[in-house]
Amino acid sequence: KSPVFGPQEVSSVEGNSVSIKCYYPPTSVNRHTRKYWCRKGASGRCITLVSSEGYVSSNYAGRANLTNFPENGTFVVNIAQLSRDDSGHYKCGLGINSRGLSFDVSLEVSQGPELPNGTEVYTVDVGRTVTIKCPFKTENAPKTKALYKKIGQTSVLVIDSRNYVNPNYKDRIRLRIPGTGQLIFTVVIDRLRLSDHGLYLCQAGDGSNRDEKNADLQVLEPEPELVYEDLRGSVTFHCALGLEVANVAKFLCRVNSRETCDVVINTLGKRDSAFEGRILLNPQDKDGSFSVVITGLRKEDEGRYLCGAHSDGQLQEGWPIQAWQLFVNEESTIPRSPTVVKGVAGGSVAVLCPYNPKESQSLKYWCLWEGAQNGRCPLLVESQGLVQEQYEGRLSLLQEPGNGTFTVILNQLTTQDAGFYWCLTNGDTRWRTTVEIKIIEGEPNLKVPGNVTAVLGETLNIPCHFPCKFSSYEKYWCKWSNTGCQTLPSQDEGPSEAFVNCDENSRLVSLTLNPVTRADEGWYWCGVKQGHFYGETAAVYVAVEEKKVAGSRYVSPAKADAAPDEKVLDSGVREIENKAIQDPRLFAEEKVVADTGDQAGGSRASVDSSSSEEQGGSSK
């Protein structure tokens, strides 16, 4: 017998949609092989209607799809706008139609329930609004108008023009009678509930001359949209609930095992701690639509999510909702990268950010997640070179190592730098990732002077001490600008007294500027790297002043000042309306930092460089 399994019988009604789930053993071969849905003909052949390779027959065009869920060993065939002609015998299967693994499914599409002649059908989602139109003749214009609900053989009054409202519809129904000449009255029902489903009767007047019109109200629960995202990646839920609730609090919640819905985030400031640092609720558009972005997806994020609107910021019956079923694929295309990076006060971190390698030309960004209200993520740096002012001299985004990874370096760390940061691009939004920076006890491994004042026209020598564990690493000096950090020639000067516990293996790499020019003013970084992978960095600011006395100026280790004043993120970064989907500048207005002049020329700047035999350790 075939190991493929599904529903043996599926029954539906005309106009409906069905979701047929077919299960298969999730072996590696099965997960990746072709999936199909075919119809058995009289000849015994099975004609493909839709397959996982993108084929859709003309009969199914625009109304069917097949989605594979390899993790669960499931594929789902969705078919919409069913007609009686769709009744028949089908197969869902793997491989080739004629000799694959398959399962027989019988689909029966029947006519909808018999409705009285002239019945108008209204199909509306739960929580939405319906307007029932009720025509009448001139002679019934002055008479009572009413709407009844048919329950079995009886009719229950719902609302009438004498101000009666059935308690079940209190505060969500109104009857509108137009001005003279218009022979139609309307009944508007807001915040539809599943219990509102049924047959209604409009009536104007009484006795044999009365006007009647039947209305069949079908209230539908939203079918969850299937969302399949990669582990460690990102998902965006777009929620459009309609203008009626544009000014009502919005929420995203997750259905739990008790079938209640736990708030994940809402516009009233509530947020589930499990999503700390990796969720944003993007500001609503004028039409009331909004979106929620969740990054750093975990297996436990799987489940059914609902977005909705209610003044309490949580799920309530009869308010509009949208639904998604989120699956998290463990066979992720998104590479593993550290979710926590640790650095010491005064030290640095180098964060590796993954991006879709097919989008090497995309713009890269790094932003700081802020949890206040709905969350926001002001951009700090981008690959085009814009850096927030308060990060000048201590933040850089590098395209290296490339091929799906870029690097962000942040130095001169303070405790205020602890927090969550997002890596993103203007391309594939599913590759947004989150990293947490933690500031731990310890000393920076690289030691540079705090403040340096150079004299115009003279020679400046800046030392950078590194411990023996970095001896096998490549050492470099670079001049920071808002477009990156331009590497300068540097010189390795051998043992140093800065690291007493590392005896003769301590090293010194120094930068020489000769002669000093006005253009040399600015931030310089000393750093270590292995190939295209960056390790620690240390920053020093060089100020340039007019010549006072003759002679060269050498900054010795003993004269190294304290680190430059810490630069704290300005809490007043202004927000702009988020366009997170089209534009990854998540709620940030970038302040352009003016380029700090020409890079120092290689002929004037030099650093002594010599190799060391000792193997270096990790830079983290």
């Epitope: 399994f5 529903p7 043996q8 019988e9 599926v10 029954s11 539906s12 009604v13 409906n16 949609s17 069905v18 979701s19 047929i20 789930k21 299960y23 869920f69 669960n72 060993g73 499931t74 789902v76 599943l194 539908l220 629960e221 079918e223 969850p224 299937l226 259905v255 095992s257 079938e259 059914r304 639904a323 079923q325 699956f327």
Partner: nanobody, 129 residues
């Protein structure tokens, strides 16, 4: 909280038939799934049949061993599921459990117990030869 109560079990001769009922109380499901599992002495619990409903659609699932002999259905009040069992044989002897859940949109194989949140106490079916 939802309670499930099975009934209709008993002793029947091989070739005979029985109709099991599973009544749910506590709430009505506008969409959901109700299934039947069975457990013979010394054996693992196994899937028998399930019925899933959502938005006017009904999906019926059967284990290979009962296809063509058993039929699952439910009443329109959405509170009771039935298992009509025919051509019974001694291998069908077991304790039959009813299981239910409100969320048919979980894409977990519903032959496994995992998708079902609510369970009944079971009703015994004995088929004598």
């Amino acid at each position: 909280e939802v309670q499930l109560v099975e009934s209709g079990g008993g002793l029947v001769q091989a070739g005979g038939s029985l109709r099991l009922s599973c009544a749910a109380s506590g709430r009505t499901f506008s969409s959901g799934i109700m299934g039947w599992f069975r457990q013979a002495p010394g054996k693992e619990r196994e899937f028998v049949a399930a019925i899933e409903w959502s938005g006017g659609n009904t999906y019926k699932y059967y284990a290979e061993s009962v296809k063509g002999r058993f039929a699952i259905s439910r009443d329109n009040a959405k509170t009771t599921a039935y298992l009509q069992m025919g051509s019974l044989n001694p291998e069908d002897t077991a304790l039959y459990y009813c299981a239910a859940d409100e969320s048919p949109s979980r894409y977990i194989d519903l032959r496994r117990p995992a998708p079902y949140h609510y369970w009944g106490q079971g009703t015994l079916v004995t088929v004598s030869s």
